[in-house]
């Protein structure tokens, strides 16, 4: 029978008091086989986190410094359920961390040294350990004792709580260094009045601080945030102009056989019973014998965690880089001007073998890292394991919505400018067998489907936004009688068709063999009725240009396309018959890696590009064989997106509605994980 | 108005499968008791499988551990009874019902008496 209690750990006498009263009040609000609430007191949360490691306990609740210190080897805890501040129909669950600065002042984040700061406090997350850890490779060497460094990067500071005997510089601004509002400086609002009195040119606090205390937008409009691309934004638009997004308290627990389905129905049972204003006999975010015992008094309530999120992802790159900083103190030899090595990720194994032949052939340029899945290369790029990679404008979608940006886009047609002129994209098809006479757009029910893999343009994202739009319901394993939708649930009708073997079957990467373009074409001409894919898809498969013993005979004229009137026509009037125009794939990374990706990726084209006449006996980064690994196969460059360099601009108002209007379908864990940190 | 819809019933030979479906439409979906109950003819309606939607634990009666699988897809409000090696007995009338608001639990969550919200029922008839 598995053990159904959670075994909450408490820090202090008050906080076991307050523990023992949830665990009462929970009994009757939960069936009796449900969860239930135990109560273990530990002496500190570093006691707490280390009991939860070793089973000893289940679940606390802890700052994002702490998830941090959870997160680590040997504990490998991860966040299950934050609580939430503000309304239940705008819950928030994170501040950003930002540095103010006045309109006028004119220098960037890469010009601070020898300014005079402003900080909340020593060692304070948003006032000290983001900005200072962000900071820290400029900061001079020796850089230990950081308050020396510190006090020698500016020329003066407000550092409330620092030794200002030891380091004078760091209460310049502020004499004495007071550590409590007794100092006018102290605090959040302290440190912005220390950039508004004009003591210092910048204030790092969190982004609500310049709205709680600038009522008046025009005064407001007096001061901007810094950006870490080194531009400048106002202050309204913290989420693209931040230090970091810092969760605001929230309950771990262990990474394996962490029982975090038990505790979310029991804290999700709890708000509903005990939660702001539900109850008077007991109150979840009310602590009458202290301040937020087991949960913060200003919580309003809670919200699960997604399950792909692990501690690094939920705080975020930025957050992870400074801590890391600031606990490691490690900077890397190599000048900061020069670009280190791009590791690209490559797709399961023949991406590999690709990428690893580049690798030796870039020398050194380009490194190679593996996962299985897309959405694991993001999460992988997003975490900085990886760099970059050229994804689907499906993917490009998520990885946007992940906070990654696009750098380079494909493309497919021979022109003179080819590297300066993107194209406006490739037209997504539905193909059918022209002896399946009958079959038009309007009578696919019951059809078997073939699809590159869920998620992506052609195969999935345009012709089932069309469908939604018809049907009105996600159940599109319903609608068709089977197919071959790679990255569908194993046991789904949309898994039926597909032809990997064992575990791989229906895994979206090139182990399934009908994912992907070719992958979908070949379902459908082995097994299926239709297959949705890209214009250049048939043409590039039949006529003996794909050698493959599936393909080597196939002809052109045997496929028709279907049209959304009902009507149907020939595969080269792809123009005047097809689903809809998809936008180019395109080469994607973390903001911080744009410019090194960018050029790196230039000079490789350069050399590996289509101006490599002879790729039997050379390296050739845009071919393999039909099975567009690392890039599509009729790539003929990577051009320079100039304006269009996010992900809305790149995919355009109407394809990102599209998605949008799909995400209540979505079975992307990562989506779901990344608008969770970014609704 | 929330309203829950069954469908997946049928006849099957002892030892086969049928898998149930029940979607819920008109209320917010995740955070609720859900599932499966069954009431043979002359006996009274009992527990077979709940789950906590959005994520939450899973409940079985001992008559049907280790045959019967409850699953959700959260995309679809829908949660579904995979059932295996079917046996005579499991013969009934298969309701879904769901617990909306703040139900008081006294006993198990394969109460009835709990769930205000029930499925018209769908019919499985297990032959030999």
């Known amino acids: 029978v598995p053990d159904k209690t959670v075994r909450w750990c408490a820090v202090s006498e008050h906080e076991a008091t307050k523990c023992q009263s949830f665990r009462d009040h929970m009994k009757s609000v939960i069936p009796s086989d449900g969860p239930s609430v135990a109560c273990v007191k530990k002496a500190s949360y570093l006691d707490c986190i280390r009991a939860i490691a070793a089973n000893e306990a289940d679940a606390v609740t802890l700052d994002a410094g702490l998830v941090y210190d959870a997160y680590l080897a040997p504990n490998n805890l991860k966040p299950v359920v934050a609580e939430f501040y503000g309304s239940k129909e705008d819950p928030q669950t994170f501040y950003y961390a930002v540095a103010v600065v006045k309109k006028d002042s004119g220098f960037q984040m890469n010009q601070l040294r020898g300014k005079k700061s402003c900080h909340t406090g020593l060692g304070r997350s948003a006032g000290w350990n983001i900005p200072i850890g962000l900071l820290y490779c400029d900061l001079p060497e020796p850089r230990k004792p950081l308050e020396k460094a510190v006090a020698n990067f500016f020329s003066g500071s407000c550092a409330p709580c620092a030794d200002g005997t030891d380091f004078p510089q760091l209460c310049q601004l502020c004499p004495g260094c007071g550590c409590s509002t007794l100092n006018q400086y102290f605090g959040y609002s302290g440190a912005f009045k220390c950039l508004k009195d004009g003591a210092g040119d910048v204030a790092f606090v969190k982004h609500s601080t310049i709205f709680e205390n600038l009522a008046n937008k025009a005064d407001r409009d007096q001061y901007e945030l810094l950006c870490l691309d080194n531009t400048r934004k106002p202050v309204d638009e913290y989420k693209d102009c931040h230090l970091a997004q810092v969760p605001s308290h929230t309950v771990v627990a262990r990474s394996m056989g962490g029982k975090e389905d038990l505790i979310w129905e029991l804290l999700n049972q709890a708000q509903e019973h005990f939660g702001k204003d539900k109850s008077k006999e007991f109150q979840l975010f009310s602590s009458p014998h202290g301040k937020d015992l087991l949960f913060k008094d200003s919580a309003h309530g809670f919200l699960k965690v997604p399950p792909r999120m692990d501690a690094k992802m939920y705080l975020g790159y930025e957050y992870v880089t400074a801590i890391r900083n600031l606990r490691e103190g490690t900077c890397p030899e190599a000048p900061t001007d020069e670009c280190k090595p791009v590791k690209w990720c490559a797709l399961s194994h023949h991406e590999r073998l690709k990428c690893d032949e580049w690798s030796v052939n870039s020398v050194g340029k380009i490194e190679c890292v593996s996962a299985e899945t897309t959405e694991d290369c993001i999460a992988k790029i997003m975490n900085g394991e990886a760099d970059a990679m050229s994804l689907d404008g499906g993917f490009v979608y998520i990885a946007g919505k992940c906070g990654l940006v696009p750098v380079l886009a494909e493309n497919y047609n021979k022109s003179d400018n080819c590297e300066d002129t993107p194209e406006a994209g490739y037209f997504a098809i539905a193909v059918v067998k022209k002896s399946a006479s009958d079959l038009t757009w309007d009578n696919l029910k019951g059809k078997k489907s073939c699809h590159t893999a869920v998620g992506r343009t052609a195969g999935w994202n345009i012709p089932m936004g069309l469908l939604y739009n018809k049907i009105n319901h996600c159940r599109f394993d319903e609608f068709f009688s089977e197919g071959c939708a790679p990255g569908s649930k194993k046991d789904s009708s949309l898994c039926k068709l597909c032809m990997g073997s064992g575990l791989n079957l229906c895994e979206p990467n090139n182990k399934e063999g009908y994912y992907g373009y070719t992958g979908a074409f070949r379902c459908l001409v082995e097994k299926g009725d239709v297959a949705f894919v890209k214009h250049q898809t048939v043409p590039q498969n039949t006529g003996g240009k794909n050698p493959d013993p599936w393909a080597k005979n196939l002809n052109e004229k045997d496929y028709e396309l279907l049209c959304l009137d009902g009507t149907r026509k020939p595969v080269e009037e792809y123009a005047n018959c097809h689903l809809a125009r998809a936008p180019n794939h395109a080469v994607v990374t973390r903001k911080d890696k744009e410019a090194c990706v960018h050029k790196i990726l230039r000079q490789q084209q350069h050399l590996f590009g289509s101006n490599v006449t002879d790729c039997s006996g050379n390296f050739c980064l845009f071919r393999s064989e039909t099975k567009d690994l690392l890039f599509r196969d009729d790539t003929v460059c990577l051009a320079k997106l100039h304006d269009r360099n996010t992900y809305e601009k790149y995919l355009g108002e109407e394809y990102v509605k599209a998605v949008g209007n799909l995400r209540k379908c979505s079975t992307s864990s990562l989506l779901e994980a990344c608008t969770f940190r970014r609704p | 108005d929330v309203q829950l819809v069954e469908s997946g019933g049928g006849s099957v030979q002892a030892g086969g499968s049928l898998r149930l479906s029940c979607r819920a439409s008109?209320?917010?979906?995740?955070?609720?008791?859900m599932g499966w109950f069954r009431q043979a003819p002359g006996k009274e309606r009992e527990g077979v499988a709940v789950l906590y939607t959005g994520g939450g634990s899973t409940y079985y009666a001992d008559s049907v551990k280790g045959r019967f699988t409850i699953s959700e897809d959260n995309a679809k409000n829908t949660v579904y009874l995979q059932m295996d090696s079917l046996k005579l007995e499991d013969t009934a009338m298969y309701y879904c019902?769901?617990?909306?608001?703040?139900?008081?639990?006294?006993?198990?969550?394969?109460?009835?008496?709990?769930?205000?919200?029930w499925g018209q029922g769908t019919q499985v008839t297990v032959s030999s």
């Open positions: 008109g209320h917010a979906y995740s955070g609720n008791y």
């Open positions: 019902a769901l617990v909306l608001g703040s139900a008081r639990w006294y006993t198990s969550s394969l109460d009835a008496r709990a769930y205000n919200i």
